[in-house]
């Protein structure tokens, strides 16, 4: 097979015919050295998935449920291109499965037992698989057959296409459970009508259903959405209140050697030549031979799925949970209102050791999961492999964009006992230089810079945001002659100054000696001209406070701060000489785990927090000899957020705006994936 060929998998005679037409028309518009199409015919989508895994084919377009099958071992396929619907300006690649109720009713998601339910149809995503999958562990046992368990959970339902003879309760609201539009409560509009007519108490539909059926906002305002955290929101807030986000139709390929760039090149060219309203002789998104062949007829085009986005992230935690529950039929033995152990995400082996020690001391209430970078940890929390971690504000922003929520803030200045309930204002991001140098904020060009890591607040977002507004471009590696900014491209001048050791050189974790606040300061001491750190860094590492060989003889007076007005001040004067105020680090978690994480951490800090005085023979949560492992070492306590419980509210408008501006320069693959 020529390496430029994409072997498309077709699942019927009609699809194979369209595939051949696709192949021939692409040949006529693409250069001979461009991508080409070959067609492989299989009996089913599952056979196509197996064929791609076995390298007998390269690509196929699948519905969400099949993307899940494709992702499971041993297939290990991943999404590479998404169909989009709607306009090019506002492309929709996902829809949201929602639970709609009337505003004048008074129950929540966890009070659905005994209510009347309206469904789009048996086995359908938004109307059955997702809601029933998520409710699965609340269904009465035995849970098989599933229809019987659902019939016993709700007091009456309309589930079009269900067997009304065996499960009459599922057809109580629509006698016969008709499987076509002859049943007035069939499909999306029908399920909504079932709610609207007062037959049912809740309708499981997609987010657009209510807008398609009620053009008038005043009418829509009579309805609300049930959220998974047992609150309600208005129908326009579906992005923050849904049962799951469901990808519409997706091209999948092998995770390794999957030709994803070639597939994108092919489909991008195909949509240019044969997309909506492009050509009379061949149309990608329709066919005289049948409906939805190879691609959905309703699709308007294709979007490349960001490379960081694997199937778990693409399908989303809620969707995977629902489908896994339905498929595997397993439920935790503990009641769902009881907190399971919290899986903490640790960065590399240094944090992992501290986490293990915490795990032992917590008697297993804390478990540990590891990742090599902060972004990998955030991804693990998103997909349920981990539950929580403490993050610098820059990563709180990324985590927030990825759907995680802040749970508790690290406090650095408030003494106990008021600490837990105090909202601190934040710390100062500063630029530190050697007293002996003649540097100012205005003559940093061509100098050697030391950063905590790319994407972090004091070390990157604040100084580079200020720099960007001055130089109006993102080529920071050209502005400084060299530097160490862990997380930069390995061949960048901003990795040149890093310490390593070798395989870990410039990695954004503790294996890189110049990582983090202490590492950036060490970089200044040993090699650099300026370090971007927090205002406490110099005092914490001078005057013998850090016993490491490189730091033990350092004096505070040998370092000064750069002020934005071009002057310099003593490190004792950060309030009058800083780059900006930075939000404190904060613990983040998935919404569904936030309460458990908060309860457990408040309990853990009472045992292992700053009230422990002897850390040489006792476990201390906020101590790691200046390494800031798991938490910053200067943390006094973890504090409640009260109403600052979203990333925007926590970080504040000014900081969010600054980071959003800097997104033009973003090198965050995770942020790209989460904003897809």
């Amino acid at each position: 097979v020529p390496e430029k060929s994409v072997r498309w998998c077709a699942v019927s005679e009609h699809e194979a015919t369209k595939c051949q037409s696709f192949r021939d028309h692409m040949k006529s518009v693409l250069p001979s050295n461009g991508p080409s199409v070959a067609c492989v015919k299989k009996a089913s989508h599952l056979d196509c998935i197996r064929a791609i895994a076995a390298n007998e084919a390269d690509a196929v377009t699948l519905d969400a449920g099949l993307v899940y099958d494709a992702y499971l071992a041993p297939n290990n396929l991943k999404p590479v291109v998404a169909e989009f619907y709607g306009s090019k300006e506002d492309p929709q690649t996902f829809y949201y499965a929602v639970a709609v109720v009337k505003k004048d009713s008074d129950f929540q998601m966890n009070q659905l037992r005994g209510r009347k339910s309206c469904h789009t149809g048996l086995g359908r995503s938004a109307g059955w698989n997702i809601p029933i999958g998520l409710l699965y562990c609340d269904l009465p046992e035995p849970r098989k057959p599933l229809e019987k368990a659902v019939a016993n959970f709700f007091s009456g339902s309309c589930v079009p296409c269900a067997d009304g003879t065996d499960f009459p309760q599922l057809c109580q609201l629509c006698p016969g459970c008709g499987c076509s539009t002859l049943n007035q409560y069939f499909s999306y509009s029908g399920a909504f009508k079932c709610l609207k007519d007062g037959a049912g108490d809740v309708a499981f539909v997609k987010h657009s259903t209510i807008f398609e059926n009620l053009a008038n906002k005043a009418d829509r305002d009579q309805y609300e959405l049930l959220c998974l955290d047992n609150t309600r929101k208005s129908v326009d807030e579906y992005k923050d209140c849904h049962l799951a986000r469901v990808p519409s139709h997706t091209v999948v390929a092998r995770s390794v050697g999957g030709k994803e760039d070639l597939i994108w090149e092919l489909l991008n060219q195909a949509q240019e030549h044969f997309g909506k309203d492009k050509s009379k002789e061949f149309q990608l998104f329709s066919s005289p031979h049948g409906k939805d062949l190879l691609f959905k007829d309703s699709a308007h085009g294709f979007l490349k799925v960001p490379p960081r986005m694997d199937a778990k992230m693409y399908l989303g935690y809620e969707y995977i949970t629902a489908i896994r529950n339905l498929r595997e039929g397993t439920c935790p033995e503990a009641p769902t209102d009881e907190c399971k152990p919290v899986k903490w995400c640790a960065l590399s082996h240094h944090e992992r050791l501290k986490c293990d020690e915490w795990s032992v001391n917590s008697a297993g209430k804390i478990e540990c999961e590891s990742a090599e970078t902060t972004e990998d940890c955030i991804a693990k929390i998103m997909n349920g492999e981990a539950d929580a971690m403490s993050l610098d504000g820059g990563f709180v922003y990324i985590a927030g964009m990825c759907g995680l929520v802040p749970v508790l803030a690290e406090n650095y200045n408030t003494p106990n006992p008021n600490c837990e309930n105090t909202a601190e204002e934040g710390y100062f991001a500063v630029a530190v230089v050697k007293s002996s140098s003649d540097l100012t904020w205005d003559n940093l060009k061509g100098k050697k810079s030391c950063h905590t890591a790319v994407g972090r607040t004091a070390g990157w977002n604040i100084p580079m945001g200020l720099l960007y507004s001055k130089i109006n471009h993102c080529r920071f590696d050209e502005f400084f002659s060299e530097g160490c900014a862990p997380g930069s491209e390995k061949n960048s001048s901003l990795c040149k100054l890093c310490m390593g050791p070798s395989p870990n050189l410039c990695e954004p974790n503790n294996k890189e000696g110049y990582y983090g606040y202490t590492g950036a300061f060490r970089c200044l001491v040993e090699k650099g001209d300026v370090a971007f750190v927090k205002h406490q860094t110099v005092p914490q590492n001078t005057g013998g406070k850090n016993p490491d060989a490189w730091a033990k003889n350092l004096k505070e007076e040998d370092y000064e701060l750069l002020c934005l007005d071009g002057s310099r001040k003593s490190v004792q004067e950060p309030a009058n000489c800083h780059l900006a105020r930075a939000p404190n680090h904060a613990v983040v978690a998935r919404k569904d785990k936030a309460d458990c994480v908060q309860t457990l951490l408040l309990d853990q800090q009472r045992m292992f927090g700053s009230s422990v005085t002897d850390c040489s023979s006792n476990f201390c949560l906020f101590e790691s000899k200046t390494k800031d492992l798991l938490f910053r070492d200067d943390t006094v306590c973890l504090a409640k957020l009260h109403d600052r419980n979203t990333y925007e509210k926590y970080l504040g408008e000014e900081y969010v705006k600054a980071v959003t501006n800097l997104r033009k320069c973003s090198t965050s693959p995770l942020l790209e994936a989460c904003t897809f």
Partner: nanobody
């Protein structure tokens, strides 16, 4: 700094038992948490079991109910009693005292445990 020496490993059949010992050159009484780790070829080192000074214990899910960790502060020794051994328990077992404070890689030699018929 306390030096630790692991012993007691060996070749054992599936279902068999072994008792590993970890002897400290100094007093472990003042050390809060002691733990056993293991590393199988090509795999990451993982926590097997840990014990605090007050006797709180914690075990990896895969060994719960089969392994028991204990410590004798008077003898400056930590033990790992391993029952119902399985082939997947094959690894080098290391003892650590966490007083190294998380960022030095000075692990001991370890003791090899091989479970095979």
């Amino acid at each position: 700094q306390v030096q630790l020496v692991e012993s007691g490993g060996g070749l054992v059949q599936p279902g068999g038992s072994l008792r590993l010992s970890c002897a400290a050159s100094g007093s472990i009484f003042s050390i809060n948490t002691m733990a056993w780790y293991r590393q199988a070829p090509g795999k990451q080192r993982e926590l097997v079991a840990g014990i605090t000074r007050s006797g709180t214990t914690n075990y990896a899910g895969s060994v719960k109910g089969r392994f028991t960790i204990s410590r004798d502060n008077a003898k400056n020794t930590v033990y790992l009693q391993m029952n119902g051994l399985k082939p997947e328990d094959t690894a080098v077992y290391y003892c650590t005292d966490y007083s190294r404070r998380y960022y030095q890689d000075d692990w001991g030699q370890g003791t090899q445990v091989t479970v095979s018929s």
